[in-house]
């Protein structure tokens, strides 16, 4: 029976040509994790195996930096980086969690007004 | 230049153990997992064991666990498989391979007969 | 585990031929894809990575494609070092499995 949940950072935002760090965490559960896999839509990012380490897609590794932890850095944002992202746990023997976060990349002008006005 | 020498293969009886050793060159050891990877006679690849760069944690196919241990020594650029309990099923050829199974050495043969 | 199914099991194609292989995995794996080519009496070797990305010193003859669960080995024109058996192997989900080979001859 699959008992653990993920965190995540959740909905965020971010300004064009900055970066950001896409977190999740797996708990209540006492499974072994052994691969985390980021996706984006329907494209795989990087993997990070608990054994064989870091493995970023080539298409990505000018823009992607491993961690930090099983977390994975976006940098250069564009616009184009808005959408939904995806942390995959493989784990034995519960199987597999996955981990929704959804990143607004804004011009830089948006992302300082929007920080202005944010409610506490 | 990637070097990685499997030492340590030979025939056993079934239920015997031997330990294969790999011996790493022309990279730095310490800073990637490495793996065990099988192929029985005639027959495809498996893989059988990986270990963290550290060694601290390990992963092993479920047809060798229980019986099979991988484990590394980073001071003497060595990795190692420890197998006990030793069936005709796990007559192979053993490869050790770096990281991301982008170099392999030449290979260790095992066969488990009586 | 994921299984991975190549054909064909064995093909023989005349030298400058082109040759495809393919490689079905039994779920979506992205590009989470390798493929290796093993000479006779040799180790493997690795050819392609993330799909299609060729390893260092590969010649450009060789080259991977696909996504998904249908990914695709060719070699634009076949010269006699290309004799060998060829696997693919996914690396999206532990454990990682290997396509049963596809061994290539020269006519």
């Known amino acids: 029976m699959m008992t653990g949940t993920i965190e995540t950072t959740g909905n965020i935002s971010a300004e064009k040509g900055g970066s950001i760090i896409l977190q999740c965490h797996l708990s209540s559960t006492t499974a072994q994790v052994t691969q985390v896999n980021w996706e984006q839509q329907d494209q795989l990012l990087a993997i990070c195996n608990a054994d064989l380490g870091w493995h970023i897609s080539p298409s990505f590794k000018d823009r992607v930096a491993p961690g930090p932890g099983l977390g994975l850095t976006l940098q250069s944002l564009t616009v184009n980086d808005t959408g939904e992202y995806f942390c995959i746990y493989h784990t034995y023997p519960d199987g597999t969690y996955t981990g929704r976060i959804f990143l607004e990349v804004l011009e830089s002008s948006v992302a300082e007004h929007g920080a202005r006005f944010q409610i506490p | 230049e990637v070097q990685l020498v499997e030492s340590g293969g030979g025939l056993v009886q079934p239920g015997g153990s031997l330990r294969l050793s790999c011996a790493a060159s022309?990279?730095?050891?310490?800073?990637?997992?490495m793996s065990w990877v099988r192929q029985a006679p005639g027959k495809g690849l498996e893989l059988v064991a990986t270990?963290?760069?550290?060694?601290?944690?390990?992963n092993l196919a479920d047809s060798v666990k229980g019986r099979f241990t991988i484990s590394r020594d980073n001071s003497k650029n060595t990795l190692y498989l420890q197998m006990n309990s030793l069936r005709a099923e796990d007559t192979a050829v053993y490869y050790c391979?770096?990281?991301?199974?982008?170099?392999w050495g030449q290979g260790t043969t095992v066969t488990v007969s009586s | 585990d994921i299984q991975m199914t190549q054909s064909p099991s064995s093909l023989s194609a005349s030298v400058g031929d082109r040759v495809t292989i393919t490689c079905r995995a039994s779920?979506?794996?992205?590009?989470?894809l390798a493929w290796y080519q093993q000479k006779p009496g040799q180790s493997p070797k690795l050819l392609i990575y993330?799909?299609?990305t060729r390893q260092s010193g590969v010649p450009s003859r060789f080259s991977g494609s696909g996504s998904g669960t249908d990914f695709t080995l060719t070699i634009s024109s076949l010269q006699p070092e290309d004799v060998a058996t060829y696997y693919c192997?996914?690396?999206?989900?532990?454990?990682?499995?290997f396509g049963g080979g596809t061994k290539v001859e020269i006519k």
């Open positions: 391979v770096r990281g991301y199974f982008d170099y």
């Open positions: 022309g990279f730095t050891f310490s800073s990637y997992g």
């Open positions: 192997q996914q690396y999206y989900s532990t454990p990682y499995t």
């Open positions: 993330w799909a299609s």
């Open positions: 779920q979506d794996i992205k590009t989470a």
């Open positions: 270990i963290k760069s550290s060694g601290g944690s390990t």
